[in-house]
């Protein structure tokens, strides 16, 4: 099957504060069609939060999630 029919997700601004790590369930990079780089965190309550991929806390959460996958 080819890539899923999922809507394009872009970040136009980033969260200004660090989300508690235990709130996060998953993550993905924003679409290659977006003008701004971004990581989208999915919370356990199914909210999507935009984060700046250059922030160290964002990278830590991503690598921790990757290790636990």
């Amino acid at each position: 099957s080819l890539a899923a029919d999922t809507p394009t997700a872009c970040c136009f601004s980033y969260t200004s504060r660090q989300i508690p790590q235990n709130f996060i369930a998953d993550y993905f990079e924003t679409s290659s069609q977006c003008s701004k780089p971004g990581v989208i965190f999915l919370t356990k309550r199914s909210r999507q939060v935009c984060a700046d991929p250059s922030e160290e806390w964002v990278q830590k959460y991503v690598s921790d999630l990757e290790l636990s996958a």
Epitope: L2, S31, S32, E66
Partner: antibody, heavy 115, light 107 residues
């Protein structure tokens, strides 16, 4: 561990097309964009474009629009780049790389276009 | 497109030297500037991400600095295994672009 596997070489005739593969393993394929980069001795490293495996979204360098077509297959965790109407100018090493920071790269596919 | 200009094109070094490689952007790339090392017949390898962030497995002698349009990769005591090409790259805007590279060679 994270790996991007690419075939080592492709030999294709001028005017033909080629479809290169980049098989990802060791991470969730849909979490990161896959980028394609061309390297030639004269031109250095050139970004061709990127594909988002989650939904198939693509972004292309204007220079490669009409030349390259990027796709992704979630079921096999493989990204593809098709290059069409090949000429000797397309002979190069083509790399796939993962994510904004290009933290992992494939070994590269050497494309030779020759009759 | 953002043009990245690297200098010098070639740097001749002696093991133990401290060296600085420059990358200048034609417009601001914010913090989205990365450095790669490429040895002959190998794939590029990420050395520094987001201007100054270190990468697991990369020796601590490599460091990055700068902001906006002016960036530097420093190697504080060059070893022979560091010889090769060094590229900067920006991921702030499409198309992502690379510098032409700096070749690090033995004096």
């Amino acid at each position: 561990q994270v790996q991007l596997q690419q075939p080592g070489a492709e030999l294709v005739k001028p005017g033909a097309s080629v479809k290169m593969s980049c098989k990802a393993s060791g991470y969730t394929f849909t979490s990161y964009n896959i980028h394609w980069v061309k390297q030639t001795p004269g031109q250095g490293l050139e970004w061709i474009g990127a594909v988002s495996p989650r939904n198939g979204d693509t972004s292309y360098n204007q220079r490669f629009k009409g030349k390259a077509t990027l796709t992704a297959d979630i079921s096999s965790s493989t990204a593809y780049m098709q290059l069409s109407s090949l000429t000797s100018e397309d002979s190069a090493v083509y790399y796939c790389a993962r994510g904004y920071g290009y933290d992992y790269w494939g070994q590269g596919t050497t494309l030779t276009v020759s009759s | 497109d953002v043009v990245l200009t690297q200098s010098p094109a070639t740097l001749s070094v002696t093991p133990g030297d401290r060296v600085s490689l420059s990358c200048r952007a034609s417009q601001s790339v914010s913090k989205y500037l990365h450095w790669y090392q490429q040895k002959s017949h190998e794939s590029p390898r990420l050395l520094i991400k987001y201007v100054s962030q270190s990468i697991s497995g990369i020796p601590s002698r490599f460091s990055g600095s700068g902001s906006g349009t002016d960036f530097t990769l420093s190697i504080n005591s060059v070893e022979t295994e560091d010889l090769g090409m060094y590229f900067c790259q920006q991921s702030n805007s499409w198309p992502h672009t690379f510098g032409a590279g700096t070749k690090l060679e033995l004096k």
